[in-house]
Amino acid sequence: GSERTCCPVNWVEHERSCYWFSRSGKAWADADNYCRLEDAHLVVVTSWEEQKFVQHHIGPVNTWMGLHDQNGPWKWVDGTDYETGFKNWRPEQPDDWYGHGLGGGEDCAHFTDDGRWNDDVCQRPYRWVCETELDKASQEPPLL
């Protein structure tokens, strides 16, 4: 594949990454799959600067990111190390709350109305953000 040099239509470029902001809601797994089908991944927040950029674009709306602990440890979908990486949880979060009555705890992370993170039930239909890196090889064949 060829190296992607500019963002697809309707995607926003920022710091050598492209971002797509949904305007509808999906469960976390469906949002994750949507991004993968776009040769991207749910957004991985690696810095305060990136946090502010995403926050500016999503506004005060619950929005999924690419962070979950469905199999135990917290993991970013692109393999970025959670332990040493950037974190922006709300106070008292994550709490893996079981009191919602939906079964299980809270295994998927989202931006809250103030931008800070919360863990929530992965089935909730929140908006989402896809991200892809400009420097990574595209799956599309090169133009001849």
Epitope: W74, D95, D96, Y98, G104, G105
Partner: antibody, heavy 115, light 107 residues
């Protein structure tokens, strides 16, 4: 590397108290629910208690409710289990474990309640 | 509270055998089920979470299936190191509860 090390077990008389500790390392402690699970001699596993990452939510098995208190000190990366009014049936190896799916366990500490 | 039952309580098998252990919940727990392996004198080891998701480092001869109330742990080809006691656990709601265990020993 994730490590969980329990301590504080020992022999105690019925009605007595004991405080177990679990020192955690190798991960972002405050991001995880922590649990205590016990296993009586020759018995199966019994979930005892859990606490949210920040410590604001606690959960207990009916068998220990009102007698045991789970807590944590995130500044010290340590989980605690205060056990009061101990009974013979509380005799067990007590394990500390990370998360609902128990992806990491300590090696356990033995609590013996006997006169 | 949700009660968990396991069958059989024990079984004898040989290396290379296919082994199936079943776990049943007293109410619907979706896929909030984990499986553990424990050897004498050792802490339990997590094998599977979310009913069928194999934990990192667990051999592929282990598999889990099921949803709702009925679940299965399958060992496709029993290895010498697989002789142990196996427990299921629901984490649908507190208090979490374990099954009574299934001991797999040498035939």
């Amino acid at each position: 590397e994730v490590q969980l090390l329990e301590s504080g077990g020992g022999l105690v008389q019925p009605g007595g108290s004991l405080r177990l500790s679990c020192a955690a390392s190798g991960f972002s402690f405050s991001s995880y629910v922590m649990s205590w699970v016990r296993q009586g001699p020759g018995k199966g596993l019994e979930w005892v208690s859990a606490i949210s990452g920040s410590g604001d939510r606690t959960y207990y098995a009916d068998s220990v409710k009102g007698r045991f208190t789970i807590s944590r000190d995130n500044s010290k990366n340590t989980l605690y289990l205060q056990m009061n009014s101990l009974r013979a049936e509380d005799t067990a190896v007590y394990y500390c474990a990370r998360t609902a799916t128990k992806d990491y366990w300590g090696q356990g500490t033995l609590v013996t309640v006997s006169s | 509270d949700i009660q968990m039952t396991q069958s059989p309580s024990s079984l004898s098998a040989s290396v290379g055998d296919r082994v199936t252990i079943t776990c049943r919940a007293s109410q619907v727990i979706s896929n909030y089920l984990a499986w553990f392996q424990q050897k004498p004198g050792k802490a339990p080891k997590s094998l599977i979470s979310a009913a069928s998701s194999l934990r990192s480092g667990v051999p592929s001869n282990f598999s889990g299936s099921g949803s709702g109330t009925d679940f299965t742990l399958t060992i496709s080809s029993l290895q010498p190191e697989d002789f142990a006691t196996y427990y299921c656990q629901q984490y649908h709601s507190y208090p979490f509860t374990f099954g009574p265990g299934t001991k797999v020993d040498f035939k």
